[in-house]
Amino acid sequence: MAPWPELGDAQPNPDKYLEGAAGQQPTAPDKSKETNKTDNTEAPVTKIELLPSYSTATLIDEPTEVDDPWNLPTLQDSGIKWSERDTKGKILCFFQGIGRLILLLGFLYFFVCSLDILSSAFQLVGGKMAGQFFSNSSIMSNPLLGLVIGVLVTVLVQSSSTSTSIVVSMVSSSLLTVRAAIPIIMGANIGTSITNTIVALMQVGDRSEFRRAFAGATVHDFFNWLSVLVLLPVEVATHYLEIITQLIVESFHFKNGEDAPDLLKVITKPFTKLIVQLDKKVISQIAMNDEKAKNKSLVKIWCKTFTNKTQINVTVPSTANCTSPSLCWTDGIQNWTMKNVTYKENIAKCQHIFVNFHLPDLAVGTILLILSLLVLCGCLIMIVKILGSVLKGQVATVIKKTINTDFPFPFAWLTGYLAILVGAGMTFIVQSSSVFTSALTPLIGIGVITIERAYPLTLGSNIGTTTTAILAALASPGNALRSSLQIALCHFFFNISGILLWYPIPFTRLPIRMAKGLGNISAKYRWFAVFYLIIFFFLIPLTVFGLSLAGWRVLVGVGVPVVFIIILVLCLRLLQSRCPRVLPKKLQNWNFLPLWMRSLKPWDAVVSKFTGCFQMRCCCCCRVCCRACCLLCDCPKCCRCSKCCEDLEEAQEGQDVPVKAPETFDNITISREAQGEVPASDSKTECTAL
């Protein structure tokens, strides 16, 4: 593992920009620079080694001023001003605006629907496996195992509410204690943040857009990971979440409430239920060791059923096994007893695509996974395109200023807390933190929202999803009310604790710095984004899961040296950047390590070799495949969607030449125009939103 990518011989200097050095990034964009900046700001030619080569297109130019890659781009208005238009032009422009709004809402609708179907697809592919994770008896004694199970299950079912409801049903049926459930809830919090990270991957086409989008998405990941890193040991030591929530649950005499309002589902369900409908109870039944459930399909076939309670006669090994001594007999051959059963009569089939196909869950899941990712990607690209054409000039300035500007002094500090409330409110409305944060991601990418503003919105989203859970808990039946409410409150207080740790003091806003660092790395080495996703959401949890199954000794034996090395590297990194003089000369930089341990460059070469075959066939028949291709091969031409990567070799040869700053080609339309790919006249017909 590289202690920090691309550190080379660089001496710590806070004034200079170092690729990947999150610690040296300004935490907020310089507002004074922001207003006048255009997309043609150029990077300096001096000290080339400190410049990140962020643009895939090698455009030789003479840079004039240093540019912060985290400053929001000015989306220039290339259209005719409103005042200069005639009546016909104004009417045309008005209808264009209405059309764009309808298209935007339409794509947004299908974007949310595809997220719902993506969740269903994941449940079909990995739901049963997720259920089996829960049936592991070691969860009770090992909080770390509980944590990774929470992560893995939520990643597999793409829904924290599903994994939380499984936990609730297990607690209410005494298969799990609240104490054992808390780490699982923490893990579910981490797992749910994978969705917007996947969404961010869809914006891989433009480096600077991808940098912002990926950082904006992973700020959620880092907040959750850091919160767990601090709060899980605190919880294990003090059980503060368990105690606080128990006191709350016991002090209030809750009446069963109404069901939590399904606000967004009301709109999306009519469409998504035509695609697929799932029987979510199956995963819960598997988690509760129901053997019959393992052979059941998650795909719901019958939507209208009649349930009739009746007594049936069942054979038992001997009369000692009778359910009731008075209801026991033999027919001379077998021993019988009466059992109360609920007989389900199927009346009407569900109305969805897969109802009559009788395909295995894995097949249905795979089909839906591919289709939902394609729709998700397509919608996202279209949303970004429409927003890109709408949010230009004055409109962009107004929106960006509204969203990103703080309250006047002395109330500036309140802005973030208002953003937290807005995030919580919006998540409560859409009933899903995944949907809210996923919708936020492209906005961060195109530069409408800063990461500094996205951070409190994301934190608010974390709170919003727990308030939904609390409402759902209050609507639970009597036997599940206590446990579900306590778990929902644990989730709530865990997020509150996390916010108190990583938000109030600007210095403690580590998730922003870490996300920006990861954004920088991923912008340069785009494969690293996928690598990060696999490592943090699959490999690390699976490794911990495997080691936990092997026992405490193995877990400690492997874990302690790994943790020790990480702490050592972090301490050394901190000393190198803050006070290098206290260190021996050899330890003042990472040069004492082999290149593959301190830089991603050698790894990049390996990845490039593997993806070389893709590079030569980097065909851009459509934007979607083009994006996937860009992610794999870092191809300079495919992201502009030209025919193929013919000039690949020349592009690779010219990689060490100074390049234009990343913000230069933020807006796709402008970048194409600047390169002569789009005739100038094309953009003149663009209509600025009113």
Epitope: N313, T315, T319, P325, S326, L327, C328, W329, T330, D331, G332, I333, Q334, N335, W336
Partner: antibody, heavy 120, light 107 residues
């Protein structure tokens, strides 16, 4: 209507075997258990054993095990009881009776009985 | 094996009289008891099953009661055609066992 028609009376020598048949009609043979009960002259009823024709699962009273064999022919809806190593105390009227499988209604229909006499 | 003891072994009474036959099981059999009627020279006929449920076609004058170890067959008003031997049978555990029988006669 429901009928269980048994084979005619038999006179056997000690040590020999006897095979009594019970032909059924008027009901689904495979949905019932066929039991065999005997009654020695002037005595009570004694259960011998039973067979589930559907899967040929049998059970016998301990003192008849090894001597009695119950079989069923689904094609003709007929049940058979073969008793070997006959002794004089095996002289009795042998009845077949049906019992609805998986139900607690007991032996609701009986055959007319087959008299087996064992004498030298 | 569970022993079923019937009493009396025989009884003689007048037409229209109430007749009560008891059956005692050597251990708890719940309600898994059946009563059969066997007329001279005929095969047995099911009267009562599950201790108190009348079989189809059985006259209402026949009723059964009891649970556990003590069971009763009652003929509320004895009719001439009721002359027969009555057997109780337990079907709680295998092997199935019958009572010794109660012979009912009319004076």
């Amino acid at each position: 209507q429901v009928q269980l028609v048994q084979s005619g009376a038999e006179v056997k020598k000690p040590g020999s075997s006897v095979k009594v048949s019970c032909k059924t009609s008027g009901f689904f043979f495979t949905e019932y258990i066929i039991h065999w009960v005997r009654q020695a002259p002037g005595q009570g009823l004694e259960w011998i054993g039973g067979i589930i024709p559907n899967n040929d699962v049998t059970n016998y009273k301990q003192n008849f095990r090894g001597r009695v064999t119950l079989t069923a022919d689904k094609s003709t809806s007929t049940a058979y009881m073969e008793l070997s190593s006959l002794r004089s105390e095996d002289t009795a009227v042998y009845y077949c009776a049906r019992w609805r499988n998986a139900y607690y209604s007991a032996m609701d229909s009986w055959g007319q009985g087959t008299t087996v006499t064992v004498s030298s | 094996d569970i022993q079923m003891t019937q009493s009396p072994s025989s009884l003689s009474t007048s037409v229209g009289d109430r007749v009560t036959i008891t059956c005692t099981a050597s251990q708890d059999v719940g309600t898994a008891v059946a009563w059969y009627q066997q007329k001279p020279g005929k095969s047995p006929k099911l009267l009562i099953y599950w201790a108190s449920t009348r079989h189809t076609g059985v006259p209402e004058r026949f009723s059964g009661s009891g649970s556990g170890t003590d069971f009763t067959l009652t003929i509320s008003s004895l009719q001439p055609e009721d002359v027969a031997t009555y057997f109780c049978q337990q079907y709680r555990t295998s092997p199935l066992t019958f009572g010794g029988g109660t012979k009912v006669e009319i004076k």
